[in-house]
């Protein structure tokens, strides 16, 4: 029975050329997280955090993606093309998969509003 919930940073905006943290948090479950997948709006995988093997950043994103903090992901050197949906998929035992959605808007303006549904400590 899937009792858990995924909280995400929700809809966020960031400045072109800057960086942004994508963060998901799984709560309300005793399930064990075995892998977290991060993917982009076109379903291409950005990165995987495997419980045993650690982080794997996919080659196309190696220069612009940094692992962490925690199970999150940091996108750097943002371009306008980075605007869109991002998904975290938590593979958990024995619950199954939990999926969270974040919408990132990359702004041309010098000042970008940054709103989040929760603060990362």
């Amino acid at each position: 029975m899937m009792t858990g919930t995924i909280e995400t940073t929700g809809n966020i905006s960031a400045k072109k050329g800057g960086s942004v943290i994508l963060q998901c948090h799984l709560s309300s479950t005793m399930a064990q997280v075995t892998q977290v997948n991060w993917e982009q709006h076109d379903h291409s995988l950005l990165a995987i955090r495997n419980a045993e093997l650690g982080w794997h950043i996919y080659p196309a994103f190696k220069d612009r993606v940094a692992p962490g903090p925690g199970l999150g992901l940091t996108l750097q050197s943002l371009t306008m093309n980075d605007t869109g949906e991002y998904f975290c998929t938590y593979h958990t035992y024995p619950d199954g998969t939990y999926r969270g959605r974040i919408f990132l808007e990359v702004l041309e303006s010098s000042v970008a509003e940054h709103s989040a549904r929760f603060q990362i400590p």
Epitope: M1, M30, A31, Q32, V33, T34, Q35, N50, A51, E52, L53, H91, T92, Y93, P94, D95, G96, T97
Partner: antibody, heavy 122, light 107 residues
Framework: EVQLVQSGSDLKKPGASVRVSCKAS????????MNWVRQAPGHGLEWMGW????????TYVQGFTGRFVFSLDTSVNTAYLQISSLKAEDTAVYFC???????????????WGQGTMVTVSS | DIQLTQSPTFLSASVGDRVTITCRAS??????LAWYQQNPGKAPKLLIY???TLQSGVPSRFSGSGSGTEFTLTISSLQPEDFVTYYC?????????FGQGTKVEIK
């Protein structure tokens, strides 16, 4: 080599307690959930439940609540099963088994301990 | 709870035979099914996971197929060491039950 090594067979009297240990080696203990499976003589396999090796939180299948306790000592990469107030019907082989596979569609019990025979008899 | 029913419970066959064991689930479990082999007095050994993926080190004469509610384990050519007991297990929705087992005996 990835392996799980369990403690030896035990003979106990009704009402006593027993602790079965399961020592893991060859992998990162806290990266894989650990399960316990019972097999009564001449019978099939019964999943008793599992323990989250990250948090130590145990989950028990219906029928294995109350007298059964799963625990861990991560400093020595060992999982434990304790059974209290033993009854004759607890006589069985108890196995620990690692959940292998990292994605939900590939989970399975990929590494098993050799089993520990617990006999309850007066 | 999802129940698994294996058939047959006993199977008599000869060395070299092709045999098939069926596992039926009481509800749809996608491809979340594993097959295990157990020798008497030994721990089970994982043969197949995700319904059809052969576990590393397992001989290629073993294969698995199916999805949804009906699954099969096939041994293409029985070897003397294959005359043991086989179990299916679903890993889709708690609790992860096992089938009752199929004992393969020498005819």
């Amino acid at each position: 080599e990835v392996q799980l090594v369990q403690s030896g067979s035990d003979l106990k009297k009704p009402g006593a307690s027993v602790r079965v240990s399961c020592k893991a080696s060859g992998y990162t203990f806290t990266s894989y959930p650990m399960n316990w499976v019972r097999q009564a003589p001449g019978h099939g396999l019964e999943w008793m439940g599992w323990i989250n090796t990250n948090t130590g939180n145990p989950t028990y299948v219906q029928g294995f609540t109350g007298r059964f306790v799963f625990s861990l000592d991560t400093s020595v990469n060992t999982a434990y099963l304790q059974i209290s107030s033993l009854k004759a019907e607890d006589t069985a082989v108890y196995f620990c088994a690692r959940t292998g596979g990292h994605t939900y569609d590939s989970y399975a019990f990929d590494v098993w301990g050799q089993g520990t025979m617990v006999t309850v008899s007066s | 709870d999802i129940q698994l029913t294996q058939s047959p419970t006993f199977l008599s066959a000869s060395v070299g035979d092709r045999v098939t064991i069926t596992c039926r689930a009481s509800q749809v479990i996608s491809s979340s099914l594993a097959w295990y082999q157990q020798n008497p007095g030994k721990a089970p050994k994982l043969l197949i996971y995700a319904a059809s993926t052969l576990q590393s080190g397992v001989p290629s004469r073993f294969s698995g197929s199916g999805s949804g509610t009906e699954f099969t384990l096939t041994i293409s050519s029985l070897q003397p060491e294959d005359f043991v007991t086989y179990y299916c297990q679903h890993l889709h929705g708690y609790p992860y039950n096992f089938g009752q087992g199929t004992k393969v005996e020498i005819k």
